[in-house]
């Protein structure tokens, strides 16, 4: 997580900045939500622990045609060290329940805010 270019600035982005930008994007999604996010699509919930960024991407990448989360998908790919494609689930990703994308985003946002407050930027 040393070089996260391409989000808001042309060069390498410090981890704290990248995390703040991801949080800002999730806040933007939740605040601008009028109709059900991604039309009520459901995704696998994740454990908000180690490997969380890749797990979040693995879950959200399956949703296509939802412009509201496309930027989030791109941003998450910058936090995940390996390439993620649809239908791919790591061993960290326990498939025990599906939740609406809106709830997924809210849960992720709350956790990322906590990490930011605690100074855990990667």
């Amino acid at each position: 997580l040393t070089c996260l270019g391409g989000f808001a600035s042309p060069g390498p982005v410090p981890p704290s900045t990248a995390l703040r930008e991801l949080i800002e994007e999730l806040v933007n999604i939740t605040q601008n939500q009028k109709a059900p996010l991604c039309n009520g699509s459901m995704v696998w919930s994740i454990n908000l622990t180690a490997g969380m960024y890749c797990a979040a991407l693995e879950s959200l990448i399956n949703v296509s045609g939802c412009s509201a989360i496309e930027k989030t998908q791109r941003m998450l790919s910058g936090f995940c060290p390996h390439k993620v494609s649809a239908g791919q689930f790591s061993s960290l990703h326990v498939r025990d329940t599906k939740i609406e994308v809106a709830q997924f985003v809210k849960d992720l946002l709350l956790h990322l805010k906590k990490l930011f407050r605690e100074g855990q930027f990667n």
């Epitope: 059900p36 991604c38 039309n39 009520g40 699509s41 459901m42 995704v43 399956n62 949703v63 296509s64 939802c66 239908g87 498939r95």
Partner: nanobody, 116 residues
């Protein structure tokens, strides 16, 4: 486009059984992960079960584990949900869904009422 049509709902007594079916068309059914989702009166959406394209993986909400069984017949483009030991709290409209698609792609749903 994607078309899904559920059937098999109805009124059943507590402890009874029902088998829901979902006829699918307009997409490659045998390569699609499929879900059953339900909505109880006045409540939000609740995920019930998922089956992988190959039928190898089946997943259930804790609330239905051991009572419901999801299955599919790829040759008939049909998804099933066998519901046993039904409870009053299973009363809901049940929707069949192509996984990761929004409600505009879901079927109209089938109402299951569990009551004595």
């Amino acid at each position: 486009g994607v078309q899904l049509l559920e059937s098999g709902g109805g009124l059943v007594q507590p402890g009874g059984s029902l088998r829901l079916s979902c006829a699918a068309s307009g997409f490659t059914f045998d390569s699609a992960e499929m879900d059953w989702v339900r909505q109880a009166p006045g409540k939000g959406l609740e995920w019930v079960s998922t089956i992988s394209p190959s039928r190898r993986g089946t997943y259930y909400a804790d609330s239905v584990k051991g009572r419901f069984t999801i299955s599919r017949d790829n040759s008939k483009n049909t998804l099933y949900l066998q519901m046993n030991s039904l409870r009053a709290e299973d009363t809901a409209v049940y929707y069949c869904a192509k996984a990761y698609t929004g409600r505009s792609y879901w079927g109209p749903g089938t109402l299951v009422t569990v009551s004595s």
